[in-house]
Amino acid sequence: EPTMYGEILSPNYPQAYPSEVEKSWDIEVPEGYGIHLYFTHLDIELSENCAYDSVQIISGDTEEGRLCGQRSSNNPHSPIVEEFQVPYNKLQVIFKSDFSNEERFTGFAAYYVATDINECTDFVDVPCSHFCNNFIGGYFCSCPPEYFLHDDMKNCGVNCSGDVFTALIGEIASPNYPKPYPENSRCEYQIRLEKGFQVVVTLRREDFDVEAADSAGNCLDSLVFVAGDRQFGPYCGHGFPGPLNIETKSNALDIIFQTDLTGQKKGWKLRYHGDPMPCPKEDTPNSVWEPAKAKYVFRDVVQITCLDGFEVVEGRVGATSFYSTCQSNGKWSNSKLKCQPVDCGIPESIENGKVEDPESTLFGSVIRYTCEEPYYYMENGGGGEYHCAGNGSWVNEVLGPELPKCVPVCGVPREPFEEKQRIIGGSDADIKNFPWQVFFDNPWAGGALINEYWVLTAAHVVEGNREPTMYVGSTSVQTSRLAKSKMLTPEHVFIHPGWKLLEVPEGRTNFDNDIALVRLKDPVKMGPTVSPICLPGTSSDYNLMDGDLGLISGWGRTEKRDRAVRLKAARLPVAPLRKCKEVKVEKPTADAEAYVFTPNMICAGGEKGMDSCKGDSGGAFAVQDPNDKTKFYAAGLVSWGPQCGTYGLYTRVKNYVDWIMKTMQENSTPRED
């Protein structure tokens, strides 16, 4: 507890103080008082700098004194041998003795009393801005007339704040203008106009005289304008140093006038008015503004329309124009919206073709689709070149937005067939010579791939098994090879309606309309070992003449084996139908005359014993296209024969082209249309 006075005595006083002692006293008097500490007795072992024994007086962090030795009073009327006066209300006294004393020392006796301090004069920093009044235990500040004491109870200022100006036009001046403004004041004026109007401040140079800046350029008195996050100033000096017209871009303006204790001048006077908030005529690329004006202000509305090939993207929706309003804050609404080049996006991929990754997918960019050559070509033309159009679609000059379609190239083997030695009497072949060749394992037979989804074969091949398993792409039909080849799964078998179904197929003598189509579940991927054969055209160019050569292929019976391990092939000439009729049927199941011969059949063979045989059924009789010598078409399908190694009969495919096309169209997937 603070006390007004007190006594401090060394240990054992007035007896000798003990060795090795350290004792401290914390003196505290009430706030507003200083401390007068005086010693009436001092008998402490003397040493240099009082290093051995001492009494130390500390005020805050400052050592006020350190005493040792003997002292006596200089004044016969006063017992005081040493005294200290501090203007603070706290003091610490520390007594220390070392381990030995050469003589007997009695220590010290000291007293303290609280003394008044004059806050108005005793300190370097004057506590009051104007008038300071001291009293015992404290002080108070007071102000001259028309000034008031601030809440800090130290500073005086004039009452110049709190004015709010809401009129669209007005005048504001510093206090007492043009007489000198009050010192040590902070005047705040607020201008608050309705939203959409900006405060415009105008000053005349001669209407401004404020104490000039110091040598460092800092204003001692200053005028500052604050509009939102923008600040104009501080301004000071003789004559207004800032722009005479200040467009604040805000409907709210705070004017702050700050003065110090010295150097009053006449001050300042300004006028203000409210302008409708202007919005800048922004440069929005690739667009047109409607209406076009030199200046836009609050509440003006414009329509911004993008040029062709540009669009406004907002979320996921693209638009070609948008409206923008000049807002109360001087900013355009929808200012984030921009006319960007239309982005056609990553082009769609196409089956059996590709499109190079475009450098850009923006308006005007060009891409090129290509088909996987040489196995596919672009069916619907257009060259494959597409550009990114203004509507955001990839567009081709011919097809428009329709994608190109890559369809299999037909009738072109990767490697031409060459007869190596003299199917019966045929040669070894490679599947690359006959990439359209399809292998049926039950019954053991053949077929011809005519497009991605369809296999052409003989009706008698599929009449007993409507779910045949087929393979493509293998020269050998050994199990290990078939396991590596492509297995085709049928979706449906279509037998020609003219094919007569029998109770006992083995006794068949009528092979008219021996043709069937197998629709596949999945499309076949074309390549060097798998690719379709063409169908004949309907023109007379595709009418076969006797002697025209065709190729047959298959894994049917050979001279040596019932079934060929590897694909065999032969080149045969077309023969008159009578040649086939003349051959005696090897194992007749009926009378020779019972066998039916029709114009739907082609007779071929009879040369060097080359012929198709059991197990080759359904395979194509491939003839060179008369209009494109690089291609082969299926002129016939291996159907039946009187005797292997002589002449064989083949279904005349040309007579069935309409049925084939109709069947495929009626049973195609939507993607094929």
Epitope: F439, D441, T479, S480, A483, W555, K560, R561, R563, V565
Partner: antibody, heavy 119, light 107 residues
């Protein structure tokens, strides 16, 4: 009709080699793919390897890699299988088998050759 | 390599019983599976190929089913001649591998 005739039974010491032959009749070796299968007494069937004429390479089961060699002499239509570094667990009947067509794994089997490995 | 696991290893049954043997592949082999019958001292005989195709000359009481990794051989009515060991074999890719065999014995 294809027939496969194998060489006779053999008794070999551990570490030795054995060469089993298989003569084809009724067809030519060039038209066929010859496989070799073995069966230890009272145990299951084990595929050893084959010559793949399409690829022109011999494919050996991983288990026998480095120890087995399969060769063919097309002039005599004879296939051979040689197994080296014999151990007692190689005691088995060794079959030569022709690969089938159209999904059938094996068409024709030889009569089998018993190889006994014993010290 | 593709592992083939047959179950059961041994099966006791009587004449006239319906018998089912299963074969599991360690990975998909599509339908490339065959079943064999072997009698002591004889070479194996092909019964079924391509999972469900019956080899010519094999009695119709034998049937096969399955694709991918799960396959079954069924003997609809066991005959005295059917007591033997049965093997499955995958021919999807080299190495061609056999199951360990299932012995069908008289109960």
């Amino acid at each position: 009709q294809v027939q496969l005739v194998q060489s006779g039974a053999e008794v070999k010491k551990p570490g030795a080699s054995v060469k089993v032959s298989c003569k084809v009749s009724g067809d030519t070796l060039t038209e066929l793919s010859m496989h070799w299968v073995r069966q230890a007494p009272g145990k299951g069937l084990e595929w050893m390897g084959t010559f793949d004429p399409e690829e022109g390479e011999t494919i050996y089961a991983q288990k026998f890699q480095g120890r087995v060699t399969m060769t063919e002499d097309t002039s005599t239509d004879t296939a051979y299988m040689e197994l080296s570094s014999l151990r007692s667990e190689d005691t088995a009947v060794y079959y030569c088998v022709t690969e089938g067509l159209g999904g059938r794994p094996f068409d024709h089997w030889g009569q089998g050759t018993l190889v006994t490995v014993s010290s | 390599d593709i592992q083939m696991t047959q179950s059961p290893s041994t099966l006791s049954a009587s004449v006239g019983d319906r018998v089912t043997i299963t074969c599991r592949a360690s990975q998909s082999i599509s339908s490339w599976l065959a079943w064999y019958q072997q009698k002591p001292g004889k070479a194996p005989k092909l019964l079924i190929y391509k999972a469900s195709s019956l080899e010519s000359g094999v009695p119709s009481r034998f049937s096969g089913s399955g694709s991918g990794t799960e396959f079954t051989l069924t003997i609809s009515s066991l005959q005295p001649d059917d007591f033997a060991t049965y093997y499955c074999q995958q021919v999807n890719s080299y190495d061609w591998t056999f199951g360990q065999g299932t012995k069908v014995e008289i109960k």
